[in-house]
């Protein structure tokens, strides 16, 4: 008789990343009998929800259900019906919602309640929506990339399965850039972590890790831009802001009320003699870089060394994966290659920012103008943050790997979050059996 294929014994999980600028849904899949093995979970789908981040729905909460529909229906299609009731769904909200909660806990709670109400309508095993801490965001990003890079596996391999993998078990640091916050997470070399808030202890697969992490709220690329504008408009002589971070010929009107809407600009807030001002781009990388540096307070440090704003940062150690907006921005600028030195990146940024806006629009006709206009700022901000903020140097630049995906799974906090909540990262090394049950089939 002909052998009949056994039904695939797999499990699925869904994580929604409710970021400050948008929400993405990720579907993960793994073999049911290998739950505790490292590296078996992989992403099968990413669905980007059309529209802004959930914090923008504060005045229109009843639109949240419709907003989430397309991606949740996509999940219904991708995951076999027989698995729906067993598939956990998690939603983690990040810095956009942290900022909303700072403004009003009641409004943030209302948004989350309506999000939960909407997600509960689907036939999955919904586990709730919550605002994750910056520390969690950093930690789960670090877990994700090291899980996908095979760093937690105790088996040493003579071949490399992923592009960035070195044969040693040294973990990668994680650099995450969002719209409203940025995280830095790594294992320092024999260095005590001087501030308890930045210290994490993990035991994963039988090994102990002492991890440093910090999340800089308001230092995601979008909030950093608002900060810079609020800082610069203070010293503008009129309602024209000549801005070196935008291309020559670029013009945009900004409402002062929008500028001061975010808690991130509170420290720069002042009464202005106008309700609107116009940004006029002058496209000068060096001046843009200088303006950005003013956002980092490096004059005060109560520790042996700091990143900025008095936040402890140990000496950088090992290789780093830079993902999320670090990757998207550098990818757009064609600067993700391992061969591009920091000096070359700076040169390219100088040229890019100096290009006239009309020329840029023609060269990148398919890109939305709102995003296109901000790449000069974002690229310059990334360089400023990595070099002056985190103290990377021209030499250590080569240890930064701009990563979008690893083995087909997006680098980011969502996979680590799901692995943790589904208890799929054991503290101890699982007992290895010579043959799995499936071998006997």
């Amino acid at each position: 008789t002909q052998n009949k294929a056994l039904p695939e014994n797999v499990k699925y999980g869904i994580v929604l990343d409710a970021g400050s600028s948008h929400t993405s849904l990720y579907i993960y899949k793994w073999p049911a009998e290998k739950e505790n093995d490292t590296g078996v979970v992989h992403q099968v789908e990413e669905c980007r929800v059309k529209g802004p981040g959930i914090s923008k729905f504060v005045q229109k909460v009843n639109e949240i259900g419709i907003y989430l529909t397309d991606c949740m229906e996509r999940a219904r299609e991708v995951i076999p019906r027989s698995q729906h009731q067993e598939t956990p769904v998690y939603l983690g909200a990040t810095a956009g919602m942290r900022l909303l909660r700072m403004e009003s806990e009641e409004l943030a709670d209302r948004v989350l309640d309506v999000v939960e109400r909407s997600l509960s309508n689907y036939p999955f095993d919904f586990q709730g929506a919550r605002i994750i801490t910056g520390q969690e965001e950093g930690a789960y990003g670090w877990i994700t990339i090291n899980y996908l890079l095979g760093k937690f596996s105790q088996k040493t391999r003579w071949f490399s399965i992923v592009p960035y993998e070195t044969n040693n078990q040294e973990t990668f640091g994680a650099l995450d850039l969002g719209g409203a916050s940025t995280q830095v997470t790594f294992v320092p070399q024999n260095q005590t972590i001087e501030s308890p808030d930045n210290a994490l202890q993990f035991r994963l697969y039988g090994k102990d890790y002492n991890v440093y992490t910090h999340s800089f709220l308001c230092y995601g690329k979008d909030q950093a831009l608002w900060q810079k504008l609020a800082k610069d408009i203070q010293v503008a002589s009129n309602e024209i802001l000549r801005d070196p971070c935008f291309h020559p010929g670029y013009k945009k009107v900004v409402n002062v009320s929008d500028l001061y809407k975010t808690p991130c600009t509170k420290r720069f807030e002042m009464t202005l003699p106008f309700q609107q001002f116009e940004i006029q781009g002058i496209g000068n990388y060096q001046q843009c870089h200088q303006s950005i540096l003013e956002l980092f307070n490096t004059s005060y440090c109560p520790y042996s060394q700091c990143a900025f704003n008095g936040i402890f940062l140990p000496p950088l150690q090992g290789d780093f994966g830079a993902f999320s907006a670090f990757y998207f921005v550098m990818k757009f600028l064609n600067l993700t290659s391992e061969k591009v030195s920091q000096e070359k990146v700076t040169e390219m940024m100088k040229k890019f920012c100096a290009q006239p806006w009309e020329e840029i629009k023609t060269s990148y006709a398919g890109v939305k103008e709102k995003y296109l206009s901000e790449y000069c700022f974002s690229g310059t901000y990334i360089l400023s943050l990595l070099l002056q903020g985190y103290h990377f140097t021209a030499d250590s630049w080569e240890h930064i790997h701009f990563i979008g995906k690893i083995q087909g799974s997006d680098a980011g906090w969502t996979l680590g979050y799901m692995l943790n909540l589904t208890n799929m990262i054991p503290a101890e090394q699982p007992l290895s059996t010579p043959l799995s049950h499936s071998t006997y089939v």
Epitope: R110, L119, S120, N121, P123, F126
Partner: antibody, heavy 119, light 107 residues
Framework: DVQLQESGPSLVQPSQSLSINCTVS????????VHWVRQSPGKGLEWLGV???????DYNAAFMSRLSITKDNSKSQVFFKMNRLQADDTATYYC?????????????WGQGTLVTVSA | DIVMTQSHKFMSTSVGDRVSVTCKAS??????VAWYQQKPGQSPKALIY???YRYSGVPDRFTGSGSGTDFTLTISNVQSEDLAEYFC?????????FGAGTKLELK
């Protein structure tokens, strides 16, 4: 074992208020929303309102002006109050919850409390 | 408000029969429909959610189908304990609304 139990008066005078307590066990009110539904021979099942786990509420617009739902997480109690009752508010009042945090269909119901509005 | 119409107030059946209870929504509710069974003096019990997913512990003779505006609860091989009233409910939008019920009785 998830349980919900309503307790309140069986008889209310017209134009007076109705207060019902729903005491829950087997789950935490900080993790789940609790709904209120009533049932009468004349109007069938009617959804009245819900208090979500974080404390925000949604009410049926038909009852909003006279309905209030609050809770005390530490006591595992949900409080239902309806003002200005009339004869057609005579019904069995249920508290109910879904299978997940905020499900809007009901896997668990209390036994119900029959309330008669009469002079 | 969305009106859920159960056109049959009563339906007659015999043990072992197959019976279908229908429910119509006044507007599209996707698959956000639940079905309940209620026996005299008891609270409603959930049978089906998301139009076609059986709630845990519900016998597989109960099946739900439909989407949009038309929904059906089918009981194949009716048992005597199935003689009860059946309600549909939409949870696509607020306020949540129920059908008026269909009472299943013996022929």
């Amino acid at each position: 074992d998830v349980q919900l139990q309503e307790s309140g008066p069986s008889l209310v005078q017209p134009s007076q208020s109705l207060s019902i307590n729903c005491t829950v066990s087997g789950f935490s009110l900080s993790s789940y929303g609790v709904h209120w539904v009533r049932q009468s021979p004349g109007k069938g099942l009617e959804w009245l309102g819900v208090i979500w786990r974080r404390g925000s509420t949604d009410y049926n617009a038909a009852f909003m002006s006279r309905l209030s739902i609050t809770k005390d997480n530490s006591k595992s109690q949900v409080f239902f109050k309806m003002n200005r009752l009339q004869a057609d508010d005579t019904a069995t009042y249920y508290c109910a919850k879904g299978i997940s945090t905020a499900t809007s269909w009901f896997a668990y119901w209390g036994q119900g409390t029959l309330v008669t509005v009469s002079a | 408000d969305i009106v859920m119409t159960q056109s049959h107030k009563f339906m007659s059946t015999s043990v072992g029969d197959r019976v279908s209870v229908t429910c119509k929504a006044s507007q599209n509710v996707g698959t956000n429909v639940a079905w309940y069974q209620q026996k005299p003096g008891q609270s409603p019990k959930a049978l089906i959610y998301s139009a076609s997913y059986r709630y845990s512990g519900v016998p597989d003779r109960f099946t739900g189908s439909g989407s949009g505006t038309d929904f059906t609860l089918t009981i194949s091989n009716v048992q005597s304990e199935d003689l009860a009233e059946y309600f549909c409910q939409q949870y696509n939008s607020y306020p949540l609304t129920f059908g008026a019920g269909t009472k299943l009785e013996l022929k």
